[in-house]
Interface confidence: medium
C-alpha cells in the first residue's frame, strides 16, 4: 500500500473555532482500515469517514467541528497491511487564536506605600504576544513582550490591575487583580475564661479581622484589677487562639484582656474580662475517726477541722465514704462531726474514711477506720464501747479472713 496525505500541506494552520478536515489517501488496498494518530495516540473519534475513489484507492477523513488549542499537534494516518503498519507523512496542525493566558495577575494585600510586583504571561500562536497593563481604566504600561512584570512603587488604597495580551488575531483581557491595603488587625472578641483552678486559668478568644496580613501572635495581659498593676503578660503564637495562665494566686480577683498583632502591628485590646481563681481545697484530714456501737447501728465521730488559712475559705460539710469486702459501698455528706451509719452488713468488715470539703473540693481523706465483723457477732461488747483501728497503708487488700486485730486497706481508698 502506498500512503500519502492528499491535498493537505505538511503544515496546516487554522483559526480557533474553525472546522478542520484532514484527508488521508490510501492506494493499493481494497478495504483499508484507516486509523488516525495524534502525537502518538490513536484518535478515538467517531468523526472518521471513508470514501472509495476506486477499488484500490480510498480517502479517509478526520473531521473536527471546531478547532481549539488542544487539537494542535502532529497527525498522521496508518493502515495495517500484511501484519505491518504503514504510516503516512505527518501533518502539523497549528491552531491560531487570540492570546491565551498562562499567568494572570493575582490578588495581593500589601502595606500602604510598599512596593510590589504583578506578573502576566500569554502565548499564541500566533506569536509575538505583547502585554499592556491597566490600573483601573487607565493604561499604565506597555506594550511589552510577554511575559511581563509590572513593578508598582506602592498604593494608598485598594486598586484594581489587569493586563491585556495582543497578537495578530486580536486581544484577550486577563482577570482583574485587586491589590488590597494591609491594616492593623481588629480587636479580638468573645474572650472567655474556659477553665479555672486555684492557680491556673485557660483563656480562649476569637480573632478579629486580620487586616489582610497574617496574625502572628496575641498578647494576654493580666492584672489584679482592671487598669491595675500588670501581674502577667503572655505572648502566644497563633493559631490556636488559646492561652494557659499559670502560677496565679488562689482565691484572687483578676482581670485580663487580649490583643493580636500582624506584621503591621498590634490590634486594640479587647474589653477587660474579670475572673476569680478558685481557693485551695482543705489541707487537713479529719483526725480521730472512731466508731460507737449502739443498738440501732453504728455512730461515727471525728474531730472538727479548723481552716489553716484564708485561702481555704469556709469549710463546708464532711464527706463520709465506707466500703465492705462484699463490694457494698456508699458515700454520705454530713454537716457536723458525727454520722449514723445504716445500710451496712454487720457480718462483714467495714472500712470508713472521712474528709472535709469546701467550695473547691474535698481535702485529704482521714486514716481509714476498720470495724471488724467480729465486733458485731453475737452482740459482743458493751453497747457504748468505742473501738478504732489505725490501718497501716500498703497492707494487703485481698485477705478474706481477719482476726480481731487485723487491719487492711481497700483499693478504692488509694489516691
Amino acid at each position: 500500500a502506498g500512503l500519502k496525505l492528499m491535498g493537505a500541506p505538511v503544515k496546516l494552520t487554522v483559526s480557533q473555532g474553525q472546522p478542520v478536515k484532514l484527508n488521508c489517501s490510501v492506494e493499493g488496498m481494497e478495504e483499508p482500515d484507516i486509523q488516525w494518530v495524534k502525537d502518538g495516540a490513536v484518535v478515538q473519534n467517531l468523526d472518521q469517514l471513508y470514501i472509495p475513489v476506486s477499488e484500490q484507492h480510498w480517502i479517509g477523513f478526520l473531521s473536527l467541528k471546531s478547532a481549539e488549542r488542544s487539537d494542535a499537534g502532529r497527525y498522521w494516518c496508518q493502515v495495517e497491511d500484511g501484519g505491518e503498519t504503514e504510516i503516512s507523512q505527518p501533518v502539523w496542525l497549528t491552531v491560531e487564536g487570540v492570546p491565551f493566558f498562562t499567568v494572570e495577575p493575582k490578588d495581593l494585600a500589601v502595606p500602604p506605600n510598599a512596593p510590589f510586583q504583578l506578573s502576566c504571561e500569554a502565548v499564541g500562536p500566533p506569536e509575538p504576544v505583547t502585554i499592556v497593563w491597566w490600573r483601573g481604566t487607565t493604561k499604565i504600561g506597555g506594550p511589552a513582550p510577554s511575559p511581563s512584570v509590572l513593578n508598582v512603587t506602592g498604593v494608598t488604597q485598594s486598586t484594581m490591575f489587569s493586563c491585556e495580551a495582543h497578537n495578530l488575531k486580536g486581544l484577550a483581557s486577563s482577570r482583574t487583580a485587586t491589590v488590597h491595603l494591609q491594616a492593623l488587625p481588629a480587636a479580638p472578641f468573645n474572650v472567655t475564661v474556659t477553665k479555672l483552678s486555684s492557680s491556673n486559668a485557660s483563656v480562649a478568644w476569637m480573632p478579629g479581622a486580620d487586616g489582610r496580613a497574617l496574625l502572628q501572635s496575641c498578647t494576654v495581659q493580666v492584672t489584679q484589677a482592671p487598669g491595675g498593676w500588670e501581674v502577667l503578660a503572655v505572648v502566644v503564637p497563633v493559631p490556636p487562639f488559646t492561652c494557659l495562665l499559670r502560677d496565679l494566686v488562689p482565691a484572687t480577683n483578676y482581670s485580663l484582656r487580649v490583643r493580636c498583632a500582624n506584621a503591621l502591628g498590634p490590634s486594640p485590646y479587647a474589653d477587660w474580662v474579670p475572673f476569680q481563681t478558685k481557693g485551695l481545697a482543705p489541707a487537713s484530714a479529719p483526725q480521730n475517726l472512731h466508731a460507737i456501737r449502739t443498738d440501732s447501728g453504728l455512730i461515727l465521730e471525728w474531730e472538727e477541722v479548723i481552716p489553716e488559712g484564708p485561702l481555704e475559705g469556709p469549710l463546708g460539710p464532711y464527706k463520709l465514704s465506707w466500703v465492705q469486702d462484699n463490694g457494698t459501698q456508699d458515700e454520705l455528706t454530713v454537716e457536723g462531726t458525727r454520722a449514723n451509719l445504716t445500710g451496712w452488713d454487720p457480718q462483714k468488715d467495714l472500712i470508713v474514711r472521712v474528709c472535709v470539703s469546701n467550695a473547691v473540693g474535698c481535702g485529704p481523706w482521714s486514716q481509714p477506720l476498720v470495724v471488724s465483723s467480729h465486733d458485731h457477732a453475737g452482740q459482743q461488747g458493751p453497747p457504748h464501747s468505742r473501738t478504732s483501728w489505725l490501718v497501716p497503708r500498703g497492707s494487703s487488700a485481698h485477705h478474706h479472713h481477719h482476726h480481731h486485730h487485723s487491719a487492711w486497706s481497700h483499693p478504692q481508698f488509694e489516691k
Epitope: 478536515k21 478495504e31 482500515d33 484518535v43 478515538q44 473519534n45 467517531l46 468523526d47 472518521q48 469517514l49 471513508y50 470514501i51 472509495p52 475513489v53 480510498w58 477523513f61 473531521s63 473536527l64 467541528k65 471546531s66 481549539e68
Partner: antibody
C-alpha cells in the same frame, strides 16, 4: 436500494440469552459502520454502540458496556446484538442503523440515514 | 455520563415557526444531528452536521448551532410535522454517541 433487514420479534424469560441480527443489502457492507439503538416502550432513543466496517473494533455507550456484545460477519453482511443474560429492563425495540462511512458520490456522507425496521424484544417471566 | 437536554414538548399553530433546542457541553466541538420519529415508525434523519439538510427533507426544516446549544427550526410548521424530535451528538472525547431525551412537537 439500501436495506437493513432485522430478525423477528422475540419473547424471552429473564436470565435467558438472545442474539438478534441485522442483514444489510444494497451497498458494500464493509464501507459503513453499523450502530444499534434501543427504544423502550413510550421512551426515547438510546445509542448502544457500534461496530466498525471491518468488524474489528466496537464502541459502546457507558450504560451498555459489559451488558451486550456487538459483532458482525462480513461474509454474510450481517451485524449482531447479543445478550448473555436478559433482564426485564431489556424489554424494548432495537434498531440497527447504517453509520457514517463511504459513498461513491465522493462527498462526506450523511450519518445515520438508513434504519432497520426494528426488532421487538420482550423479557417477561 | 454525557447528556443532551431537550424540552419535553413544544406546541405551535399551523404555519407558525417551531424551535426545538438541544444543549450539551460538547456541542461547541461536536456536530449535532436531528431525527424525526412519527408514532410507530423508525426515526428519519432530518439535519446532519449542525445545519445540513438530509435528502428528501423539506426546506422548512433548518438547523443551527451556537456554543453549547443546537436548534432545529421548522418555519411554517405543518400538521404532518407533528412527531417526536431527537438531537444526537458525541461526547467530548468522541468515544460514544448520545441522544437527547426527545421533544414532542404538537401542531394544533
Amino acid at each position: 436500494e439500501v436495506q437493513l433487514v432485522q430478525s423477528g420479534a422475540d419473547v424471552k424469560k429473564p436470565g435467558a440469552s438472545l442474539t438478534i441480527s441485522c442483514q444489510a443489502s444494497g451497498y458494500t457492507f464493509t464501507d459503513y459502520w453499523i450502530s444499534w439503538v434501543r427504544q423502550k416502550p413510550g421512551k426515547g432513543l438510546e445509542w448502544m454502540g457500534q461496530i466498525n466496517r471491518h468488524a474489528s473494533n466496537t464502541m459502546y455507550g457507558p450504560s451498555f458496556q459489559g451488558h451486550v456484545t456487538i459483532s458482525a460477519d462480513r461474509s454474510t453482511a450481517t451485524a449482531y446484538l447479543q445478550w448473555r443474560s436478559l433482564e426485564a429492563s431489556d424489554t424494548a425495540m432495537y434498531y440497527c442503523v447504517r453509520s457514517g462511512g463511504a459513498t461513491s458520490g465522493g462527498t462526506i456522507p450523511e450519518y445515520y440515514q438508513h434504519w432497520g425496521p426494528g426488532t421487538l424484544v420482550t423479557v417477561s417471566s | 455520563s454525557y447528556e443532551l437536554t431537550q424540552p419535553p414538548s413544544v406546541s405551535v399553530s399551523p404555519g407558525q415557526t417551531a424551535r426545538i433546542t438541544c444543549s450539551g457541553d460538547a456541542l461547541p466541538k461536536k456536530y449535532a444531528y436531528w431525527y424525526q420519529q412519527k408514532s410507530g415508525q423508525a426515526p428519519v434523519l432530518v439535519i446532519y452536521e449542525d445545519w445540513k439538510r438530509a435528502s428528501g427533507i423539506p426546506e422548512r426544516f433548518s438547523g443551527s448551532s451556537s456554543g453549547t446549544m443546537a436548534t432545529l427550526t421548522i418555519s411554517g410548521a405543518q400538521v404532518e410535522d407533528e412527531a417526536d424530535y431527537y438531537c444526537y451528538s458525541q461526547e467530548r472525547k468522541g468515544n460514544y454517541f448520545v441522544f437527547g431525551g426527545g421533544t414532542k412537537l404538537t401542531v394544533l
